[in-house]
C-alpha cells in the first residue's frame, strides 16, 4: 500500500501513524492547495484540527472578510485556521465541533456538537450545528439556527447595528448573540464586564471574557 | 502614611540580571496589588507587569515574557521584581507602583521613587 | 494593544492661563483613564482616574473629561508647580500610556 503524502485534516494524519501534537501541513479537498494548521493528538483520542485558538491577546482578531477567508495568526498561538478550508473540508463529510474553554479562575468546560459545517462564500460561511452535550452550557451560546458569519467590512449579521464592529472580531453574530470567541482579548482583572470580550454566554453570561478558546474539529466516524 | 521605598541603582553588563525591590509601608501589603513600570532616558512610560502579593498571582507584558519575574516576602512586606538577559535597551528607571482598586485593575495611587538600572558594557 | 495619542508634545502657557492637553485612545476605553503628573527626577503623580474623577489632595483647577476614545485634561490657571510632564493611561484592556504632552513657561 501506498503511504498517504498529503492529508485533508488532522484525523487523517492521525491515523497514518503520526500521533505528536503539533503544525501539520493540510490539503485542501480536490485541490493541491495547502494551509497549516496545529493538530491536537493528544486530547479525546486525537485527531483533532484545531480551527480557532485564543491564548493571550497576542493576535489581533478584528479582522477583514478576506483575512478571515484565508485565515491568519500563528497555528503554534492565536489564529483562525480560515473559513475557506473549513467550509470546504466540513462539505465533503460529517465533522463534530468541540469548543474548549478557560475561564480565569482556572475553571474549563467544552460545549461539543456532533454535526458541524460551514455553508460556501456565497452564503457567507453561515454554521450549522446539530446535538449539543458538554459543560460549557446546555443551550447553544451559538444562536441557532446558525447566522451568516460577519467581520468589520462584511455585515451580515441580523441586528440594525454592526454587530462586528461594536462587539470586535469575525463571528456568526444573530443580533448579536450569546457568543463571540473573536472578541477582544482582556487579561485577567480586566474580564468583568466588558461587552465586547471573548464570551460565552451560556457558560459565563454576558460580561465575562475568557482567558483561552479552542475551535477543534474531526471526521464524527473517527 | 502610604509609602514605598525601592533599592539603589545598579549598573550591570548586557546578558547580566537584575533584581530591584519595593518596600511597601503604611497600607495592608498583601490588600493591593503591585506594578511595575519602566521608563527609559527621556522617555515615556511602560507597563511591565504585576503582582498579587498575597497569592503570589502574576501578570506580565508580552515584551517581556520569559524575562521577566515578579515575587514578594510578605514577612517584609516587600515586592520584587527581576529581569534577566539585560540589553542596553533594558537602561531605564523602574518603578513600582500600588493599585488605586483591587476591583477596578486601575490607575497606580502611590508609586516608588524609582531604580535608575544601566546596561552597559 | 491599545495605542494612546497624546497633543500636542508640548505646550507652551503663561502662568494663570488655561492649558488644555488631549489624549486619543485606538479603540474605545470606556471611562478607564487616568492622568499622571510628573516632574523632572521624580515618580509620576496620579492626578484624575476615571477619566474625570480627582484624586485625593489633587487641586480644582485640575479637570479631567471625556470618554471613549477622546479625552481632555484641562489645568483652569497654571501656577508655576503645575509645569511638568503630563501622561494619560488606559487601564480598560492592558495598562498603556501616552508619550506625555510638557507643559512649559511661555
Known amino acids: 500500500k501506498e503511504e498517504q503524502t498529503t492529508f485533508r485534516d488532522c484525523a487523517e494524519i492521525f491515523k497514518s501513524g503520526l500521533t505528536t501534537s503539533g503544525i501539520y501541513t493540510l490539503t485542501f479537498p480536490n485541490s493541491t492547495e495547502e494551509i497549516k494548521a496545529y493538530c491536537d493528538m493528544e486530547a479525546g483520542g486525537g485527531g483533532w484540527t484545531i480551527i480557532q485558538r485564543r491564548e493571550d491577546g497576542s493576535v489581533d482578531f478584528q479582522r477583514t472578510w478576506k483575512e478571515y477567508k484565508v485565515g491568519f495568526g500563528n497555528p503554534s498561538g492565536e489564529y483562525w485556521l480560515g473559513n475557506e478550508f473549513v467550509s470546504q473540508l466540513t462539505n465533503q463529510q460529517r465533522y463534530v465541533l468541540k469548543i474548549h474553554l478557560k475561564d480565569w479562575e482556572g475553571n474549563e468546560a467544552y460545549s461539543l456538537y456532533e454535526h458541524f459545517y460551514l455553508s460556501s462564500e456565497e452564503l457567507n460561511y453561515r454554521i450549522h450545528l446539530k446535538g449539543l452535550t458538554g459543560t460549557a452550557g446546555k443551550i447553544s451560546s451559538i444562536s441557532q439556527p446558525g447566522n451568516d458569519f460577519s467581520t468589520k467590512d462584511g455585515d451580515n449579521d441580523k441586528c440594525i447595528c454592526k454587530c462586528s464592529q461594536m462587539l470586535t472580531g469575525g463571528w456568526w453574530f444573530d443580533a448579536c448573540g450569546p457568543s463571540n470567541l473573536n472578541g477582544m482579548y482582556y487579561p485577567q482583572r480586566q474580564n468583568t464586564n466588558k461587552f465586547n470580550g471573548i464570551k460565552w454566554y451560556y457558560w459565563k453570561g454576558s460580561g465575562y471574557s475568557l482567558k483561552a478558546t479552542t475551535m477543534m474539529i474531526r471526521p464524527a466516524d473517527f | 502614611q502610604v509609602q514605598l521605598v525601592q533599592s539603589g541603582a545598579e549598573v550591570k553588563k548586557p546578558g547580566a540580571s537584575v533584581k530591584v525591590s519595593c518596600k511597601a509601608s503604611?497600607?495592608?501589603?498583601?490588600?493591593?496589588?503591585m506594578y511595575w513600570v519602566r521608563q527609559a532616558p527621556g522617555q515615556g512610560l511602560e507597563w511591565m507587569g504585576w503582582?498579587?502579593?498575597?497569592?503570589?498571582?502574576?501578570n506580565h507584558a508580552q515584551k517581556f515574557q520569559g524575562r521577566v519575574t515578579m515575587t514578594r516576602d510578605t514577612s517584609i512586606s516587600t515586592a520584587y521584581m527581576e529581569l534577566s538577559r539585560l540589553r542596553s535597551d533594558d537602561t531605564a528607571v523602574y518603578y513600582c507602583?500600588?493599585?488605586?482598586?483591587?476591583?477596578?485593575?486601575?490607575?497606580?495611587?502611590?508609586w516608588g521613587q524609582g531604580t535608575l538600572v544601566t546596561v552597559s558594557s | 494593544e491599545i495605542v494612546m495619542t497624546q497633543s500636542p508634545a508640548t505646550l507652551s502657557v503663561s502662568p494663570g492661563e488655561r492649558a488644555t492637553l488631549s489624549c486619543r485612545a485606538s479603540?474605545?476605553?470606556?471611562?478607564?483613564l487616568a492622568w499622571y503628573q510628573q516632574k523632572p527626577g521624580q515618580a509620576p503623580r496620579l492626578l484624575i482616574f476615571?477619566?474625570?474623577t480627582r484624586a485625593t489632595g489633587i487641586p480644582a483647577r485640575f479637570s479631567g473629561s471625556g470618554s471613549g476614545t477622546e479625552f481632555t485634561l484641562t489645568i483652569s490657571s497654571l501656577q508655576s508647580e503645575d509645569f511638568a510632564v503630563y501622561y494619560c493611561?488606559?487601564?480598560?484592556?492592558?495598562?498603556?500610556f501616552g508619550r506625555g504632552t510638557k507643559v512649559e513657561i511661555k
Open positions: 493611561q488606559q487601564y480598560n484592556n492592558w495598562w498603556t
Open positions: 507602583a500600588r493599585d488605586q482598586d483591587i476591583a477596578t485593575a486601575g490607575p497606580f495611587d502611590y
Open positions: 476615571g477619566a474625570s
Open positions: 479603540q474605545s476605553v470606556s471611562s478607564n
Open positions: 503604611g497600607y495592608t501589603f498583601t490588600g493591593f496589588y
Open positions: 503582582i498579587n502579593p498575597n497569592s503570589s498571582g502574576t
